[in-house]
């Protein structure tokens, strides 16, 4: 139960995601350099 967040400021979260969208950054990545929306949505969008 964490309070609602102010979505007004832009920036990456701690998974490199920008405000709910996927990120594209190739530096230092060994597994995947471009992430689809599914990579960042986990079960919420896929309905799993």
């Amino acid at each position: 139960t964490i309070q609602g967040t102010n979505r007004s400021s832009k920036g990456r979260s701690l998974i490199g995601k920008v405000d709910g969208t996927s990120h594209v950054t190739g530096k230092g990545v060994t597994v995947e350099t471009v992430f689809s929306v599914d990579e960042f949505s986990a079960s919420v969008l896929t309905g799993k």
Epitope: I2, T5, S9, S13, L14, K27, S41, A42, S43
Partner: antibody, heavy 122, light 111 residues
């Protein structure tokens, strides 16, 4: 309640590998990323990498690439981190942490495991 | 040496206001969200501020976060003995493509 429970302490010899587990409960396991963070004795926090438990996608700190593997078993809601070619300076407490961000939210690393002490000594 | 610079220590007496700084660069704090963690001795870290200035429920409103340019700060007003802990800032770094933590600040409550 949301909880992460990690495996017990490990003592390893240099050159060996260690695999630490992190069992999640109280929420949908595949819904949130896991970070792994370590803390050497008396030192600060150091990020190792993350895994998306839904897809298995991983992303590691440059320092650990080639030595770290992150996996998950969705059937038992457990994430794993394996570190190979251990050195004495890998001695640390290793934490798993759930990332509270998802499609329309972002709370940072909002739930942490209790930590697993890994000692590397000959 | 950490990518994010924090003072190693800070102190104050009960009731005082203390500020802990976290200095970064244009590839981390300058463009991304800052998070603050409290770590009590012998325990796992706990989220105290997320998205620069947002407080999780359960964290007293004596704690506040702010960000300006390439620096961030955590302010604690009405200091209490239970605030004595290590505090870490964290942020995603676009150049390193990963999370970076500050070196941590040990807060001591005097008296």
């Amino acid at each position: 309640q949301v909880q992460l429970v990690q495996s017990g302490a490990e003592v390893k010899k240099p050159g060996a590998s260690v695999k630490v587990s992190c069992k999640a409960s109280g929420y949908t396991f595949t819904g949130y990323f896991f970070h792994w963070v370590r803390q050497a004795p008396g030192q600060g926090l150091e990020w190792v990498g993350w895994i998306n438990p839904n897809s298995g996608a991983t992303h590691f700190a440059q320092k650990f690439q080639g030595r770290v593997t992150m996996t998950r078993d969705t059937s038992i809601s457990t994430a794993y981190m394996e570190l190979s070619r251990l050195r004495s300076d890998d001695t640390a407490v290793y934490y798993c942490a759930r990332d509270g961000s998802n499609w329309n939210r972002d709370y940072g690393m909002d739930v942490w495991g209790q930590g697993t002490t890994v000692t590397v000594s000959s | 040496q950490s990518v994010l610079t924090q003072p190693p220590s800070a102190s104050g007496t009960p009731g005082q206001r203390v500020t802990i700084s976290c200095s970064g660069s244009s590839s981390n704090i300058g463009i991304n969200h800052v998070y603050w963690y409290q770590q009590l001795p012998g325990t796992a870290p706990k989220i105290f501020i997320y998205r620069n200035n947002q407080r999780p429920s359960g964290v007293p409103d004596r704690f506040s976060g702010s960000k300006s340019g390439t620096s961030a700060s955590l302010a604690i007003s009405g200091l209490r003995s239970e605030d004595e802990a290590d505090y870490y800032c964290a942020v995603w770094d676009d150049s390193l493509s990963g999370v970076v933590f500050g070196g941590g600040t040990k807060l001591t409550v005097l008296g």
